[in-house]
């Protein structure tokens, strides 16, 4: 003879892959204390329990190890404990109370199990900014997992000196000291659930911070073509009356900040131009000399200086022979 | 007998309160999870709340959650429903009923009408 | 939400003829459940865990389906039968019952 309960609340319910969920179950408060027996979670349709608290019985390969009878008859508690579930899981349960000394059992109503895609992704956390040449501790975590799957595999991606650090359950540290070039690479970290078989992963790119390394200044030269300086130049000749565009640019993150000066300027020089650009429309005796590109950033700066030498035309000069 | 029989219901103007109790006999009360049903004049039936044995569950309608609240009474084999903010959509027959998958009971109802 | 929409909303039949009515879900559900309805009184249980019929209902009636897509049959209509039969899902929150179809007898 069969007595029948309720499991209560929604008759379904929803797991992502690799994750954990507790199917609820209530035993009846009808249940006499006297009642001796164990507890079975079947399959739908199956004889042989996906969990079961009595020692002598077999429970399925395929469930064995994930499904766990939560079983406390006194508080009444007959829930269903499953871990890294997989696809294969999606199906209909029921639990049933089974005594081999009293005549009559009791079963409950079904409860499906729905198995989605894992839809959660890793969260990469890094404490204020990448600082070139200065370690920093990013941490991929999976806040979402439960404590009682089987830990994933952590696995980190990136063309930056790393080192790995500490690691939980849900988390992993990876020690990173990024250098100016690993700016806007691509970091990843990869977690395996091997309990499901499913991975996930999240990229996302570096935003180094760095002094300039590089000033170069590009020379626009009435309509000639354009040519650059990369390193301190001592006499660039020009001719009297010419249009000269000097334009200044650095590499760093966040971008330094340009001004041009005449002469080999001081910490606290006034700048004749406040940006990379420096125009000048008529080149003459007074422009004759050193203009000086700096390229200004918190963590350090750059410049880069170029000699203006002013070719004369011949009927242009006065007091002339 | 009736297992479930609601009571409490009556002709209540709009933004009042009303109680609703469903008395349980015949069977062991503290073994089932009780939902409210309505269904109002001419429509179809329309869930409101549930609430499980041991009251450690309760789940309502978006229509009426933050207005209606359901509890019960073990030891009283009694459910209620306090209903507050009512609104002229409310009106309807009120039925407690246990939806079990082989026991399933509903109240003969009680008629709540919020009226001007 | 899951919403359950019923069709016909009402039909008429005459006795011995079947009679087929249908649920669909917005979204798939678990399990359909069917309740039966007379005018002036409570709904019953007709149908439980999609296919199951409620003790006490007649074997002429069957049910079937899955996902989103269920239906209710009366292989032979009789007289008793009409009544407004109402589909319900709790396969998530909020708990949803169909707008019912009404049976008719000719």
């Known amino acids: 003879q069969e007595r029948r309960f309720q499991l209560e609340g929604p008759e379904s319910l929803t797991v992502q892959e690799g994750l954990c969920v507790l199917v609820p179950c209530r035993l009846p408060t009808t249940l006499p204390a006297s009642y001796y027996g164990y507890g079975y979670w079947f399959l739908e349709g199956a004889d042989v329990p996906v969990a079961t608290n009595d020692p002598d019985e077999e429970v399925q390969e395929e469930t064995r190890g994930r499904f766990h009878l939560l079983w406390d008859p006194r508080r009444k508690n007959c829930s269903l404990s499953i871990r890294d579930a997989r696809r294969r899981d999606n199906a209909a349960y029921f639990f049933r109370l089974k005594s081999k000394w009293m005549k009559y059992g009791y079963t409950s109503s079904k409860l499906s199990v729905r198995v989605m895609a894992l839809t959660h992704r890793p969260n990469i956390s890094i404490p204020g900014t990448l600082e070139s040449g200065h370690p920093s501790n990013l941490t991929c975590s999976v806040p979402w997992v439960c404590e009682q799957g089987t830990p994933p595999i952590f696995s980190w991606m990136s063309a930056a000196p790393t080192s790995l650090g500490p690691r939980t359950t849900q988390s992993s540290v990876l020690t990173i000291t990024p250098r100016p070039q690993d700016h806007s690479t691509n970091l990843t970290c990869q977690v395996t659930f091997p309990g499901a078989g499913v991975t996930m992963e999240r990229t996302i790119q570096l935003n180094v911070s760095y002094a300039p390394q590089k000033v170069a200044i590009s020379i626009f030269q009435g309509n000639s073509a354009a040519f650059k300086i990369l390193q301190n130049t001592s006499s660039l000749p020009v001719l009297e009356g010419q249009a000269l565009r000097l334009l200044c640019d650095a590499d760093g993150n966040p971008p330094a900040h340009l001004s041009w000066f005449q002469g080999f300027p001081a910490l606290n020089a006034t700048p004749i131009s406040n940006t990379g650009v420096l125009e000048l429309p008529q080149v003459g005796s007074a422009e004759e000399g050193d203009f000086t590109c700096r390229a200004q950033h918190p963590l350090g700066s750059l410049q880069i200086s170029l000699s203006l030498f002013v070719h004369w035309k011949p009927e242009g000069r006065a007091g002339g022979v | 007998e009736v297992p479930l029989v609601e009571s409490g219901g009556g002709l209540v103007k709009p933004g009042g309160s009303l109680k609703l109790s469903c008395a349980a006999s015949g069977f062991t009360f503290s073994d089932y999870g009780i939902h409210w049903v309505r269904q109002a004049p001419e429509k179809g039936l329309e869930w409101v709340a549930y609430?499980?044995?041991?009251?450690?569950?309760?789940y309502y309608a978006d229509t009426v959650k933050g207005r209606f609240t359901i509890s019960r009474d073990n030891a009283k084999n009694t459910l209620f429903l306090q209903m507050t903010s009512l609104r002229s959509e409310d009106t309807a027959m009120y039925y407690c009923?246990?939806?079990?998958?082989?026991?399933?009971?509903w109240g003969t109802g009680t008629t709540v009408t919020v009226s001007s | 939400q899951i919403v359950l929409t019923q069709s016909p909303a009402i039909m008429s039949a005459s006795p011995g003829e079947k009679v087929t009515m249908t649920c669909s879900a917005n979204?798939?559900?678990?399990?359909m459940h069917w309740f039966q309805q007379k005018s002036g009184t409570s709904p019953k249980r007709w149908i439980y865990d999609t296919s199951k019929l409620a003790s006490g209902v007649p074997a002429r009636f069957s049910a079937s389906g899955s996902g989103t897509s269920y239906s209710l049959t009366i292989s032979s209509m009789e007289a008793e039968d009409a009544a407004t039969y109402y589909c319900?899902?709790?396969?998530?929150?909020?708990?949803?019952f169909g707008a019912g179809t009404k049976v008719e007898l000719k």
């Open positions: 009923a246990i939806l079990d998958w082989y026991f399933d009971v």
């Open positions: 319900q899902q709790w396969s998530s929150n909020p708990l949803t």
């Open positions: 979204s798939s559900v678990s399990f």
């Open positions: 609430i499980t044995s041991v009251s450690s569950t309760i």
